[in-house]
C-alpha cells in the first residue's frame, strides 16, 4: 500500500532564497551546516536535473548510514522539487521506496513555508504508521533550521 504524510514548516527566509539554498545548492550547503546529520551528497549519475541519482551519507548523529535518491522534478519558477528514495537502510524491511515533493511558498507575514508531501510505498501488505514516517519530517526540519541559521548570518548569499 501507499501511505501519505504531509508536513508544513515555517521559515523566516523568503521563498526564493530558501529554494536557492536549501534545494538548488543543498547538496553543497547542507553538509557544511549540518555535518552531524549529513556528511556528504554525491551525484552518482546526472548533473542535478531529473533522473539524477544522488548518494547521501549520513553523519555520526544519525541512526542511518546512507540513502540513494532519484531526482524526479525541479521547478525553479514554482519552487517545487520532487525526489524518490530508492535505496538505503532508511527503507528498512517494510519500504520499497519513498516519494517526496517539496514546495516552498511565500508566507502571508513574510518568510516562507516549506511543504513536504510524502508517499511511503510499503512492500506487500506492510503497514506504515505515523511514528515511522515522522523521522523524515524531523530530518527535513533539522536541515531547514541549519540552513536558516546560516542564511540569517550571511545576508548577502543566495539572493
Amino acid at each position: 500500500g501507499v501511505f501519505n504524510y504531509e508536513v508544513e514548516t515555517p521559515s523566516v527566509i523568503p521563498a526564493a532564497r530558501l529554494f536557492k539554498s536549501y534545494v538548488l545548492d543543498g547538496d553543497k550547503l547542507i553538509p557544511k551546516v549540518a555535518p552531524q546529520a549529513i556528511t556528504s551528497v554525491e551525484n552518482v549519475e546526472g548533473n542535478g536535473g531529473p533522473g539524477t541519482i544522488k548518494n547521501i551519507t549520513f553523519g555520526e548523529g544519525s541512526r542511518y548510514k546512507y540513502v540513494k535518491e532519484r531526482v524526479d522534478e525541479v521547478d525553479n519558477t514554482n519552487f517545487t522539487y520532487s525526489y524518490t528514495v530508492i535505496e538505503g537502510d532508511v527503507l528498512g524491511d517494510k519500504l520499497e521506496k519513498v516519494c517526496h515533493e517539496l514546495k516552498i511558498v511565500a508566507a502571508p507575514g513574510g518568510g516562507s513555508i516549506l511543504k513536504i508531501s510524502s508517499k511511503f510505498h510499503a512492500k506487500g501488505d506492510h503497514e506504515i504508521n505515523a511514528e515511522e514516517m515522522k523521522g523524515a519530517k524531523e530530518m527535513a526540519e533539522k536541515l531547514l533550521r541549519a540552513v536558516e541559521t546560516y542564511l540569517l548570518a550571511h545576508s548577502a548569499e543566495y539572493n
Partner: antibody
Framework: EVQLVQSGAEVKKPGESLNISCNGS????????IAWVRQMPGKGLEWMGI????????KYRPSFQGQVTISADKSITTAYLQWSRLKVSDTAIYYC????????????WGQGTLVTVSS | DIQMTQSPSSLSASVGDRVTITCQAS??????LNWYQQKPGKAPKLLIY???SLQSGVPSRFSGSGSGTDFTLTISSLQPEDFATYYC??????FGEGTKVEIT
Amino acid sequence: EVQLVQSGAEVKKPGESLNISCNGSGYNFTKYWIAWVRQMPGKGLEWMGIIYPGDSDTKYRPSFQGQVTISADKSITTAYLQWSRLKVSDTAIYYCARLGATYGGADYWGQGTLVTVSS
Amino acid sequence: DIQMTQSPSSLSASVGDRVTITCQASQSIVNYLNWYQQKPGKAPKLLIYAASSLQSGVPSRFSGSGSGTDFTLTISSLQPEDFATYYCQQSYAAFGEGTKVEIT
C-alpha cells in the same frame, strides 16, 4: 578527544607580516567550520570570519575583510590567520574555534594566541 | 548586519543568588543564539546553544530561554566558579558586548 592547538605568542613590529595557526585533531577536520575570534586587551569577543576546510570556503565579517586572510590546509588539519602588514591595533588574543554544536555553536576552542604589535 | 545587545554590562551577586542576563538581537534570529562563559586568561566555553539547549557537561543550573529577538541566560543558584564574563552570540555571527558577573 577533540582538540584545537594554536601556535605560540608573537611579538612583532608594525608593518611586519604574520601567520598564526590552529591545528585540529580528534575529529574529521574537513567537515566542520573553523572560526577566528579576536579579543583586544580588556575587551570583548569579536567574530572575524570562518573557513570550511573541506573546500576552503571562507566568510569574513565585513570589518575584517581585506585586513586578514583566513586559510586552511586540510592535509595537515590546520587553519591559519594571516596579516600582510600588522598594525599596533592588531594587538590582541586570537582564538580559533570549531563550529560543531547544532546550528553553529562553537563547541571547542583553541587556547588562544597572543599577538603583540609594538614599535 | 544583525546587532546583539547584552545587558547588564556587569553585575554583582552572591553565591546562591539567581542571576539573569539578557540579550537582544536587532532583528529576529529565531532561536539561533549561543551563550558562552569566559574566565580571565582562558578561552570561552560554550554553555547553551540554540537558545535553550544545554551543552554536554554544563551544570543544569545554567539555562537559556527566548526566541525571535529577546533571549535570557539564567544561573539558578550562583556558585563560586560561575564568577566570569558571559557572552551571547548569533550563530555564525556577532557576539554581544559581554556581562561580567562579580562577587558582591
